[in-house]
Each structure stands twice: as C-alpha cells, then as structure tokens.
C-alpha cells in the first residue's frame, strides 16, 4: 500500500530545520549555524576538468510567519 507524497522525500532528505532569522541553515550538516560559518562557493575557472561541487549552504528559514524572508536556493543548488 502506497503511503503518499511524504514517502517520496526519503530518509536522506529531511525538510530543512527552521532557524531563527539570526542564523542560517547548513544543508551539509542539516542544522542551524551562525551565518558566518557558511561559505558561498567560488565559481571554478572555465575549462576546469571536474564539475563544480554543489553547495551545502542555504540562508535561514524563519520560524513563524513574516519573521524573515523564506530560504532562497543559492546558485549552486539550481
């Protein structure tokens, strides 16, 4: 018996943890950290042999309505 959409997410991809606006969510470790601990990846020079790594960084998701902007994907996540 199918369980519905929830099972599509799988155990490896839980929903991002809601951080207070003062913090940011780190997708790599899957918890909130000081935003200064996150590093936006620098683009690789053109012609690099390996593809650019996916970033594990994401701005904070706010707790509660209207407390801050929703999390936006970084270029590396697109």
């Amino acid at each position: 018996m199918r369980r519905g959409p929830r099972s599509l997410r799988g155990r490896d991809a839980p929903a991002p943890t809601p951080c207070v606006p003062a913090e940011c969510f780190d997708l790599l470790v899957r918890h909130c950290v000081a935003c200064g601990l996150l590093r936006t990846p620098r683009p690789k020079p053109a012609g690099a042999s390996s593809p650019a790594p996916r970033t594990a960084l994401q701005p904070q998701e706010s707790v509660g309505a209207g407390a801050g902007e929703a999390a936006l994907p970084l270029p590396g996540l697109l």
Epitope: T17, V20, A22, H31, C32, A34, L37, V63, G64, A67
Partner: antibody
C-alpha cells in the same frame, strides 16, 4: 508584556556551583533560542552561550570562557531557562542576564548578581 | 574571535543635539547570500538591563523611536541619534552575531555636557 525574570544569584566560594533560572512570559518561548549574557560591575557585556529551540534539537553554543564549566538547558513546558555554573572563579562575578534570541537579543531580563569570593 | 571596537568611549552631548557613534569589526559581518549585516545595537540605561535598538545593522527593534538610525556595512557601522533626549543618556553597545562566539563592543557612554 514580555517578562524575563532571573533568579538564583548570590555569593559562592571559588570552585563552587550555582544554578540560575530565568522565567519567561509574554512571548512564544518555543520560537526563541535563549541566551545568557553577563556583565561584570562597570564593564562590558559578555555572551556566554545559547540554547536553540526544540525544532533545532535544543543544541547549544558556548563561549570559550565557560565551555565545559557552564551548562544551559531549558524547560519549554514551564518556559524556564537554566544556567548551571560549576567550578566558579572570581572572574565569573557579574550580573547575569537571560535574553530571548531571534533577530538578535530581542528581550532581556533584569539580571541576577553572582559574586564568587572566599 | 571577532573584535568589536567602539568609539568614542564616552560622548558629552547637549539635549537636542545630533550625535553619531562608531562600531568597527575586524572582519566583515556581511553575509553575501542575503546581503545582511549581522550587527545589532543595544541601549543600557543606568541600573537597567540592555534593550535591543537595532538589528541587521539598520532595522529598528519594536518600539524604538525613529530618532535612532543604524547604518553601515561590512566592517564599519554607525548609530545616529537625530535629536538627543534626556532619556537617551545611556551606554550603547554594538554586537556581532555573524559567527561564534557572539561578541560585544566595549560601549559608548552618552553623558550630558
């Protein structure tokens, strides 16, 4: 009205322990991280650490000056924040404030005084 | 640790005067992804606890009068009071929350001339 009321301060000998409490009301306690900040007499503010909310697993961050000696915990059912202080030193003497942390330290208590002296 | 330096350490003012105070960090507090500066200002009146004035470097806290304005980006920040009132006499602290440990400046004390 937002209220944060600290208690438990007092005089303690070096090497001793003390537990501070902070009773919160007037805001959604579970939405906030809760922090402790201290201020020695006539000096600047010093952040000690904070505890995240249940949604973030009640994880904690501490300053190097208190890590391993102080422990922050919270009881969401009663909206109370705790600071357990062990191996106290003279330099821990200060007014201790609790603060609700969300956009920054949005709400502050009135403070409780701790004196470490023999 | 990020070091926050405030100047001047004290400021003698007259009521109605426009004043500015400075806060500098030894590394940038700007998170490029959301273009926010992780800097707050607090006011502490004599014998009282601190109160949040400004966060994100320029957003006023709840109930803070519009005579208080925060500005700056990166490493250099300013708090301006457009017309000082008697109730503004206090110590003003800046604080970074960009990285742990969260750190405060030593404060700027606003006193009467």
């Amino acid at each position: 009205e937002v209220k944060l009321v600290e208690s438990g301060g007092g005089l303690v000998q070096p090497g001793g322990s003390l537990s501070l409490s902070c009773a919160a009301s007037g805001f959604t306690f579970t939405d906030y991280y809760m922090s402790w900040v201290r201020q020695p007499p006539g000096k600047a503010l010093e952040w000690l650490g904070f505890i995240r909310n249940k949604a973030n697993g009640y994880t904690t961050e501490y300053s190097a000056s208190v890590k391993g000696r102080f422990t922050i915990s919270r009881d969401d059912s009663q909206s109370i924040l705790y600071l357990q202080m062990n191996a106290l030193r003279a330099e821990d003497s200060a007014t201790y404030y609790c603060a609700g942390y969300r956009n920054a330290m949005d709400y502050w208590g009135q403070g409780t005084s701790v004196t470490v002296s023999s | 640790d990020i070091v926050m330096s405030q100047s001047p350490s004290s400021l003698a003012v007259s009521i109605g005067e426009k004043i500015t105070m400075s806060c500098k960090s030894n590394q940038s507090l700007l998170y490029s992804t959301n273009q926010k500066n992780y800097l707050a200002w607090y006011q502490q009146k004599p014998g009282q606890s601190p109160k949040l004035l400004i966060y994100w470097a320029f957003t006023r806290g709840s109930g803070v009068p519009d005579r208080f304005t925060g500005s700056g980006s990166g490493t250099d920040f300013t708090l301006t009071i457009s017309s000082v009132k008697a109730e503004d006499l206090a110590v003003y602290y800046c604080q970074q929350y960009y990285i742990y440990p969260l750190t405060f400046g030593a404060g700027t004390k606003l006193e009467l001339k």
